[in-house]
Structure formats: structure tokens, C-alpha cells
């Protein structure tokens, strides 16, 4: 039986930070898991992975490329991210993995969220220089 | 029996303008057919449309939003999308249906493709007015 | 039918690295459903679980060899591997690949196991 | 992690025997009334061979005087009338935690 999971559809984030909720259909603190995110239409790319369970919040380890942390209670993840530039736009899907004890269970993949990080664009005006 | 669908997993634009190819696992020219673009994680907004057969080349049309036109050969219909602008980055996905004859055929939910439309910043700089 | 077979053992050097593989016949790795666990057991001694890698490609590994250790696999090959670092005496063994389902995670199928013995 | 203790370490009988051979956790491994604790049999140069399965469910192929029960902490494995094949090694193992634990074996040998 798959667990579902729901996430917001986009987040535009002009600063260079966001927080992304992963709502899931199952409580978290019922058997050890193993959260991440996961970036690109194929998921390519693992952006951010925590385990966990009842007994101790989970460390959180990012992909070279990125920044991450990570929080939940009984039925959200939430993964942020920092340091993000415009080429991190992309679409991130939430996944979660519940392995101990058994049996294994994992999420249907859900539609993802599209993060467009806007560009920062600051127009010096050009100050002739003093002699 | 469902079509496959392939598309590029993102397009970055510079320009305002984008060619989205759709190719499919079967062949156009054997029914009449419908293609249209999606935007959104859930495919919220038919972006544009085309309705085409072996005997004539479709007529696009696309939602208000957006500028569109298509085109199509045996396997492939491309999608060209102008005048966009920062906001239309987001996931597209490529939907074809087979009409007649029967039997109805569709295709299987792609991964879609991601467009992101980069902004283009142009700094003036400020020229004191003459008196 | 499902088969396991590992290959790679052999002699190596103290402060070494190996790499064992599994090639897995009868059943894909990166489908739903299955597991593959590595085992190992000294001359004479117990057994003694190393770590295992899910369809999905998640890990997890045994505290006492996390630092050393590497599982991961070819999809396109059927066929897991495992690596581990900074040899030592006590790492000699039979090496085994076991595949485990999703609902219990009991170990049904087995490989013929591969020795490593190190030492200069 | 979760210790397994398994008793006797050895012991020794006859074809036709009934033998008793015990595994204790440190901890129980019971989840939704499953007992995620199994049962290998493994005879000198071969790889192990799964015997029984949560607890109590014999693996398909094995022969019936095969058999395991308990829950929580405390499970048995049981051959009704031990034969000349079943001199071996005999491992329980838990999965209801990681790291996935070993009891440290029983030997059965003929006396």
C-alpha cells in the first residue's frame, strides 16, 4: 500500500531560500524513515536526505550542490534550502521511505513542486570616478 | 494500451520564445488525433491545442495567456510558445489523444518538461535631464 | 528462479580496499518488492550483517563498518556491489549476498558466498 | 542494537531426537503482531538457508518437522525428529531493527 504524499505546486522565492513542506498520509512517528528530496522531471538529483523515528530527530545531509536542513512532526517533513540560485529552478518531489520495522513502505510519487528562485538583478549607476 | 511520450527534461530561455517537442511511441498519421500542452505540476492549464490527421496540418490555438502555433511530422508534434515572460516558467506536459477511428487512445503521463524563462534586466543608465 | 552470485574475493593487502559484486539473476534490483543485504562470516564465527540497498537505491549500513563501507549497484547489469576500505585481519570472511522481501525482510535466497582473506 | 542469545551454543543427539534450540532478544521484536524474528540452517562450506520465517511460518521446501514459535522476546526452534541431514548450525536472526542482528549459533551434532 503506497502512502500518499502532498505538496504545494509552486513556491516563487525571490530571496535565496525556501521551505518545502512534505504532508504524508501516515504518521512518522510509527517506524524509522528516511525522508529526501529529490530535484529534476526524472529525479535525478538527491538534494537533501534525513532518517529518523520516534526517539531522535534526524540529521539532515545535502548534496554537495546544496544547502539543506530538515524538520517534522507526526506528519510533515519540511526540507529548507539556502543559498539557492536562479539555476536551481527546477521541480523537487518529496519522498519517503519507512523501513524499520517492516513491512517496507514508500509514497506514490506526487506531482513535485516547482521552485523558481527569481533573479537578483542590481543596477549600479555608474559613478565617473574622482580625480 | 497506453502512448509514451517523450520530452527534453528542461528548457532554459533566454529568449521569449520556446520550441517544445512532444515525441510519441505511434505513429500521428495513422488516426486523427488531439495534441495540447499542459502547464502546471497538475496540469491546470491547457496551453495550447491542435487537432490534425493524415488529409491536413493542424490549426493551433492557444489559451488566452499565450502566444502558440505547432507543428507535426509522423512521431513528433512540436509546440512553439512566444512573448513569454518570466512567470510561464513552470512544468509542461504533452498530451495527445487518438480520436477516431476507434479505439480512444492517450498517452501515459510524461515527467514532463520544465521551462524556465530567465528574465532579461536591462539597466538604463540615468542621464540628467537637460535645462 | 532467482539466483545470487558473488565474485571478487581473493587475497589482499592490510589497509586495502575491496570490491565484491552480486550478480543477481531471476529478479531486477530496482524493482518494488526485493532487497539485497550483505553478510559475511569470519572462519569458524557467526554471521554477521554489513549493510543492504533497497529498489530505490537508499542504504543502510551496519554502525561498526558504516565509515568503511559502500553498497551500491548497476540496474542496467543486475548486479550489486560492495566496497570496503581500510582492510584489516578481521575483515577476512565468506562474503555473501542475500536477497530479503519487502513484507518480513527474512533472508530467502542466498549466494554461494566469496572469501577475502587479508594479509601481507 | 538488538542482542540475540541463542542456547545451547552446542549440543549433542540422535537421529529420531527432539530438539529444543532457544533465541532471546534484548529487546522485543514484535510490530503489529508480527514477530520479525527468523530461523537459517547452514551446514559447514554452504551458505545459510532460511528454515522458518516470522517466528512461526515454515519457508516453502522445508521439510514439516521443522518448527518455530514464541513472541516479544523469547522463540524456539523445534525439530520434532532430528535426521542425519539435520546436523548443522542453526542461526535466528532479527529484522525489526537496524542493524539487522545474529544470534551466535547453535551447533547440533551427533552424539
Known amino acids: 500500500n503506497k502512502i500518499l504524499v502532498k505538496q504545494s505546486p509552486l513556491l516563487v522565492v525571490d530571496s535565496n531560500e525556501v521551505s518545502l513542506s512534505c504532508r504524508y498520509s501516515y504518521n512518522l512517528l510509527a517506524k524509522e524513515f528516511r525522508a529526501s528530496l529529490y530535484k529534476g522531471v526524472n529525479s535525478d538529483v538527491e538534494v537533501c536526505v534525513g532518517n529518523g523515528n520516534f526517539t531522535y530527530q534526524p540529521q539532515f545531509r545535502s548534496n554537495a550542490e546544496f544547502n539543506c536542513d530538515g524538520d517534522f512532526d507526526n506528519e510533515t517533513v519540511t526540507f529548507r534550502l539556502w543559498n539557492l540560485h536562479v539555476n536551481h529552478t527546477d521541480i523537487y518531489f518529496c519522498k519517503i521511505e519507512f523501513m524499520y520495522p517492516p513491512p517496507y513502505l514508500d509514497n506514490e510519487r506526487s506531482n513535485g513542486t516547482i521552485i523558481h528562485i527569481k533573479e537578483k538583478h542590481l543596477c549600479h549607476t555608474q559613478s565617473s570616478p574622482k580625480l | 494500451n497506453k502512448i509514451l511520450v517523450k520530452q527534453s527534461p528542461l528548457l532554459v530561455v533566454d529568449s521569449n520564445e520556446v520550441s517544445l517537442s512532444c515525441r510519441y511511441s505511434y505513429n500521428l498519421l495513422a488516426k486523427e488525433f488531439r495534441a495540447s500542452l499542459y502547464k502546471g505540476v497538475n496540469s491546470d492549464v491547457e496551453v495550447c491545442v491542435g487537432n490534425g490527421n493524415f488529409t491536413y496540418q493542424p490549426q493551433f490555438r492557444s489559451n488566452a495567456e499565450f502566444n502558440c502555433d505547432g507543428d507535426f511530422d509522423n512521431e513528433t508534434v512540436t509546440f512553439r510558445l512566444w512573448n513569454l515572460h518570466v512567470n510561464h516558467t513552470d512544468i509542461y506536459f504533452c498530451k495527445i489523444e487518438f480520436m477516431y477511428p476507434p479505439p480512444y487512445l492517450d498517452n501515459e503521463r510524461s515527467n514532463g518538461t520544465i521551462i524556465h524563462i530567465k528574465e532579461k534586466h536591462l539597466c538604463h543608465t540615468q542621464s540628467s535631464p537637460k535645462l | 528462479e532467482v539466483q545470487l552470485v558473488e565474485s571478487g574475493g581473493g587475497l589482499v593487502q592490510p589497509g586495502g580496499s575491496l570490491r565484491l559484486s552480486c550478480a543477481a539473476s531471476?529478479?531486477?534490483?530496482?524493482?518494488?518488492?526485493?532487497?539485497v543485504s550483505w553478510i559475511r562470516q569470519a572462519p569458524g564465527k557467526g554471521l554477521e550483517w554489513i549493510g543492504e540497498?533497497?529498489?530505490?537505491?537508499?542504504?543502510y549500513y551496519s554502525p561498526s563498518l558504516k565509515s568503511r563501507v559502500t553498497i551500491s549497484r548497476d540496474n542496467s547489469k543486475n548486479t550489486l556491489y560492495l566496497q570496503l576500505n581500510s582492510l584489516r585481519a578481521e575483515d577476512t570472511a565468506v562474503y555473501y549476498c542475500?536477497?530479503?522481501?519487502?513484507?518480513?525482510?527474512?533472508?530467502?535466497?542466498w549466494g554461494q558466498g566469496t572469501l577475502v582473506t587479508v594479509s601481507s | 542494537d538488538i542482542q540475540l542469545t541463542q542456547s545451547p551454543s552446542s549440543l549433542s543427539a540422535s537421529v529420531g531426537d527432539r530438539v529444543t534450540i532457544t533465541c532471546r532478544a534484548s529487546q522485543s521484536v514484535d510490530f503489529h503482531g508480527i514477530s520479525f524474528l527468523h530461523w537459517y540452517q547452514q551446514k559447514p562450506g554452504k551458505a545459510p538457508k532460511l528454515l522458518i520465517y516470522a517466528a512461526s511460518s515454515l519457508q516453502s521446501g522445508v521439510p514439516s518437522r521443522f518448527s518455530g514459535s514464541g513472541s516479544g522476546t523469547d522463540f524456539t526452534l523445534t525439530i520434532s525428529s532430528l535426521q542425519p541431514e539435520d546436523f548443522a548450525t542453526y542461526y535466528c536472526?532479527?529484522?525489526?531493527?537496524?542493524?539487522?542482528?545474529f544470534g551466535q549459533g547453535t551447533k547440533v551434532e551427533i552424539k
Open positions: 531471476g529478479f531486477s534490483l530496482s524493482t518494488g518488492g526485493v532487497g
Open positions: 536472526q532479527q529484522s525489526y531493527r537496524s542493524p539487522r542482528t
Open positions: 542475500a536477497r530479503y522481501e519487502y513484507y518480513y525482510y527474512d533472508f530467502d535466497y
Open positions: 540497498i533497497y529498489h530505490s537505491g537508499s542504504t
